[in-house]
């Protein structure tokens, strides 16, 4: 399977909410011994390997923001912790998963990574990630709502297996 990032850049005004999205593509094993671990984190813009460094989002680590379920099941974080930080991650039946960030500040600007780990019990793990940039702007040239810029077809299948 692969992870696609439909949008590579989100430009949002200060104070707005944004939902960053990734999509699981390709055949997904729905066997009983397969579960999916999906999460989000911030990273520095690695010149060689994007998303190699895992930084917290609003002080929450990727462990705090993870979803854990089988196949294309729906799930979302019900953590009070995440919601207290204005964050919520969610996943639907179609392979889409997202993180919503509320009341954006300039500190939220940066590179965000989604990570999917396919866990085959008693066997191996398969990891893929996608990357996107969030720019939070202020002032007269900030958009009134978030503006999203589609990934190029090459970028949108942002496959990095580990």
């Amino acid at each position: 399977f692969k992870v696609a990032t439909p949008y590579s850049l989100y430009v949002c005004p200060e104070g707005q909410n944004v939902t960053l999205t990734c999509r699981l593509l390709g055949p997904v094993d729905k066997g009983h011994d397969v579960t999916f671990y999906k999460t989000w984190y911030r990273s520095s813009r690695g010149e060689v390997q994007t998303c190699s460094e895992r930084r917290p989002i609003r002080n929450l680590t990727f462990q705090d923001l993870h979803l854990h379920h089988g196949g294309h099941q729906a799930a979302n974080t019900s953590h009070d912790l995440a919601q207290r930080h204005g964050l919520e991650s969610a996943s639907d039946h179609h392979g889409n998963f997202s993180i919503t960030m509320r009341n954006l500040t300039l500190l939220d600007s940066g590179l965000y990574c989604c990570l999917v780990v396919e866990i085959r019990h008693h066997h191996s793990e398969h990891r893929v990630h996608g990357a996107m940039e969030l720019q939070v702007q202020t002032g007269k040239d900030a958009p009134s709502n978030c503006v999203v810029y589609p990934s190029s077809s090459q970028d949108s299948e942002n496959i990095t297996a580990a």
Epitope: R45, L106, G139, K140
Partner: antibody
């Protein structure tokens, strides 16, 4: 369009100091503003920023040592308890290039600076 | 924090010569870098933003470029008026709006 700093003076260590940046020809609700300082013979040191919406953000070293606030026409930098290391020329600058408020384009419009001296 | 390491600290070149100033970011900052010129007793002046875009009124003798995390300011056909201190400035993140240490350019 211009910015000008004022309030720089000689104070003794620990005496609170407030520097003021006055904006002319543009609205502070349209741009982020920043404070940068320069000790005599030294380089530029970023202190912090106040966004168009009034949110403040500070360099990690400056957190707790400075407070930035604004009115409709001025931006203040408060130094609650200055030390000798805070003696410097303090610059106020508008963030963004030319008329753009894009925070990724640097600091375009600078004031001439105001000198704060801290000495006992 | 992103650390900006600027080299050299000082450089001296004759009129008509070329000066190259480098700035190394401690991590990737994309092209979010500005260059300033500062003369004694004056505030800094923005020369270049987004690594390579010249500010209006800046002569084309000034050129900015990027290779990964290394940024370069090149001043060609040096003039006496170019004598100043030059600073690079990370504009990637508002808590990392850090400046390089500066490079003094002396024109002989």
């Amino acid at each position: 369009q211009s910015v000008e700093e004022s309030g720089g003076r000689l104070v003794t260590p620990g005496t609170p100091l407030t520097l003021t940046c006055t904006a002319s020809g543009f609205s502070l609700s349209d741009y982020a503003m920043t404070w940068v300082r320069q000790a005599p013979g030294k380089g530029l040191e970023y202190i912090g920023i106040i966004s168009a919406g009034g949110y403040t953000y500070y360099a990690s070293w400056a957190t707790g040592r400075f407070t930035i606030s604004k009115t409709s026409t001025t931006v203040d930098l408060k130094i609650p308890s200055p030390t000798a290391e805070d003696a410097a020329t303090y610059f106020c600058a508008r963030v963004g290039y030319a008329d753009s408020s894009d925070i990724y384009k640097g600091f375009y419009l600078w004031g001439p600076g105001t000198l704060a001296t801290v000495s006992s | 924090d992103v650390v900006m390491t600027q080299t050299p600290a000082s450089v001296s070149e004759p009129v008509g010569g070329t000066v190259t100033i480098k700035c190394q970011a401690s991590e990737s900052i994309s092209n979010y870098l500005a260059w300033y010129q500062q003369k004694p007793g004056q505030p800094p002046k923005l020369l270049i933003y987004l690594a390579s875009t010249l500010a209006s009124g800046v002569p084309s003798r000034f050129e900015g470029s990027r290779s990964g995390t290394e940024f370069t300011l090149t001043i060609s056909d040096l003039e006496c008026a170019d004598a100043a201190t030059y600073y690079c400035h990370c504009t990637d993140s508002i808590i990392n709006y850090n400046f390089g240490g500066g490079t003094e350019v002396v024109v002989k």
